[in-house]
Amino acid sequence: DAEFRHDSGYEVHHQKLVFFAEDVGSNKGAIIGLMVGGVVIA
């Protein structure tokens, strides 16, 4: 028999990834970051 459709078996949390660049002044350059679910991780 064919299998019925189900997910992978692992819970998936859908989150928004936001890349941003922020200018912090001419003598410090820029910060480039990655925000996942509201938390800056890089």
């Epitope: 028999d1 064919a2 299998e3 019925f4 189900h6 997910d7």
Partner: antibody
Framework: QVTLKESGPGILKPSQTLSLTCSFS??????????VGWIRQPSGKGLEWLAH???????YYNPSLKSQLTISKDTSRNQVFLKITSVDTADTATYYC???????????????WGQGTSVTVSS | MTQTPLSLPVSLGDQASISCRSS???????????LEWYLQKPGQSPKLLIY???TRFSGVPDRFSGSGSGTDFTLKISRVEAEDLGVYYC?????????FGAGTKLELK
């Protein structure tokens, strides 16, 4: 809250096509992971799964009836349809539709059912 | 899906046990077992009690418990109440065709 309601012709003759409609509210088939299926129950007997349709139009049928069954949906109107061709007296039953989600938050089981619609096939 | 017994006479307060056996394993390739239990009361549509073998659906009393693996599964009701009477169906959602057991009628002695 989630509700489903089936509607059909009530009575039809052998060899005709049975058209059923499941109208629902409280969820949307445009939501990833959502699906609706059909189940039937002859009076005083057990339950038989017929077909299921997912939000992305993926469809599954009971192989023993597949040549007779067509499931479809109208996402904007919150409706799912089942057609059974060439009906016979053995297709006399109460027909239920039920929601079944695919992802964890939707339980991945038939968590809400309609009240059922009675169909009689008689000459 | 083979369900036993087909009829189960009980007294209120008794423990009740219903067995369901599949002819082949219903473990899905994702590792989950899609074995469910539904209760149908007279004149009503079926209602979900247990899914994925042992997880109670929201609002289901903890006197209901599901267990088993592979091909053999059990539904237990620890203390039967009047509102528990009806027909219990096991159901497998792992393989096509999805199939129900024949049902077990829980009734008063």
């Amino acid at each position: 809250q989630v509700t489903l309601k089936e509607s059909g012709p009530g009575i039809l003759k052998p060899s005709q096509t049975l058209s059923l409609t499941c109208s629902f509210s409280g969820f949307s088939l445009s939501t990833a992971g959502m699906g609706v299926g059909w189940i039937r129950q002859p009076s005083g007997k057990g339950l038989e799964w017929l077909a299921h349709i997912w939000w992305d139009d993926d469809k599954y049928y009971n192989p023993s009836l597949k040549s007779q069954l067509t499931i479809s949906k109208d996402t904007s109107r919150n409706q799912v349809f089942l057609k059974i061709t060439s009906v016979d007296t053995a297709d006399t039953a109460t027909y239920y539709c039920a929601r079944r989600g695919l992802y964890y938050g939707n339980y991945d089981a038939m968590d809400y059912w309609g009240q059922g619609t009675s169909v009689t096939v008689s000459s | 899906m083979t369900q036993t017994p087909l009829s189960l006479p009980v007294s209120l307060g008794d423990q009740a046990s219903i067995s369901c056996r599949s002819s082949q394993s219903i473990v899905h390739s994702n590792g989950n077992t899609y074995l469910e239990w539904y209760l149908q009361k007279p004149g009503q549509s079926p209602k979900l009690l247990i899914y994925k073998v042992s997880t109670r659906f929201s609002g289901v009393p903890d006197r209901f418990s599901g267990s088993g693996s592979g091909t053999d599964f059990t539904l237990k009701i620890s203390r039967v109440e009047a509102e528990d009477l009806g027909v219990y169906y096991c159901f497998q959602g792992s393989r096509v065709p999805l199939t129900f057991g024949a049902g077990t009628k829980l009734e008063l002695k």
